[in-house]
């Protein structure tokens, strides 16, 4: 049975949060760099796998927790290692914008899970 109990954030809520933290922002988390990820390989866990390494950045904590809740709901979420580009680092804001673009596409096509 899924944990946590409280319903996971909806895709719409995730989009709203991603918009909130990227609008009018040239940078996030003091320009911290993270590994680029392939979002098609399970977008929540893939994004989390990269973003979880960002600390001391309150701006993305809510996003991290939303991704964690969504990733936690996936079957065997903790066991799947998402495909990661270990040779490419990008700024946090770029990864968040990539995620926003991808999530919006998923939302438009109605493939929420």
């Amino acid at each position: 049975s899924p944990s946590p109990v409280t319903p996971s954030p909806t895709l719409k809520e995730l989009i709203e949060e991603l918009v909130n933290i990227t609008q009018n922002q040239a940078s996030l988390c003091n320009g911290s760099m993270v590994w680029s990820v392939n979002l098609t390989a399970g977008m929540y866990c893939a994004a989390l796998e990269s973003l979880i390494n960002v600390s001391d950045c309150s701006a993305i904590q809510r996003t991290q927790r939303m991704l964690k809740a969504l990733c936690s709901q996936k079957p065997a979420a903790g066991q799947i290692s998402s495909e990661r580009s270990r040779d490419t680092k990008i700024e946090v804001i770029q990864l968040v914008k990539n995620l926003l673009t991808y999530v919006r596409g998923v939302y438009r096509h109605g493939n929420f899970r």
Epitope: S3, P4, T6, I52
Partner: antibody, heavy 119, light 107 residues
């Protein structure tokens, strides 16, 4: 600096309920969630859940879904945990905490509130 | 839920020794493990986050390592004030879960 001050010890009867408070200071209350953790008889720690004061959103550990309700009062920068249908198994020390540096890693803790359930 | 196993409930040590406390996760938690120290009657104190990052003010004889499923907290040059309970936490997945704890005591 970040401080969390919890309410005092409670002695309650089985079946009763109790409300534990956690008053925060030293940071912007809506910036970080308040986490609640239980420790029974000096044993290990169990995560109960968290509440995000920014929007009131909560996430609970399934084991506590019928046991705890988390709320906040933004005006006083205080978080509350309401425990209900208490049994002797719920006798424990309950902690509130915040995570500032790393998401979900609680580095600032209240002093703990002892709840004893006894007839 | 992810289970964290701290196989040694007690560990005996002497002042000046080096000791390694282990924590094994039931599934891959990447590097999302933290370590806490707790002394009797006190609240837990966070030592390490994301497997190897020390919190400000934590002495550098505390070192965290590991990734995936196997994690270690190493205390080199153990001091008497290090005698305490140590808990690991996984913060990869909800619900957050703790290990059962390892009590570090004097031989």
């Amino acid at each position: 600096q970040v401080q969390l001050k919890q309410s005092g010890p409670e002695l309650v009867k089985p079946g009763a309920s109790v409300k534990v408070s956690c008053k925060t200071s030293g940071y912007s209350f809506t910036d970080y969630p308040i986490y609640w953790v239980r420790q029974s008889h000096g044993e290990s720690l169990e995560w109960i859940g968290y509440i995000d004061p920014y929007n009131g959103g909560t996430t609970y550990n399934q084991n506590f879904k019928d046991k705890a309700t988390l709320t906040v009062d933004k005006s006083s920068s205080t978080a509350f945990m309401h425990l209900y249908s208490l049994t002797s198994e719920d006798s424990a020390v309950y902690f509130c905490a915040t995570a500032v540096v790393a998401t979900d890693v609680m580095e600032n803790w209240g002093q703990g509130t002892s709840v004893t359930v006894s007839s | 839920d992810i289970v964290l196993t701290q196989s040694q409930k007690f560990m005996s040590t002497s002042v000046g020794d080096r000791v390694s406390i282990t924590c094994k996760a039931s599934q891959n938690v990447r590097n999302a493990v933290a370590w806490f120290q707790q002394k009797p009657g006190q609240s837990p104190k966070a030592l390490i986050y994301l497997a190897s990052n020390r919190y400000t003010g934590v002495p550098d004889h505390f070192t965290g390592s590991g990734s995936g499923t196997d994690f270690t907290l190493t205390i080199s040059n153990v001091q008497s004030e290090d005698l305490a309970d140590y808990f690991c936490l996984q913060h990869w997945n909800y619900p957050l879960t703790f290990g059962a704890g390892t009590k570090l005591e004097l031989k």
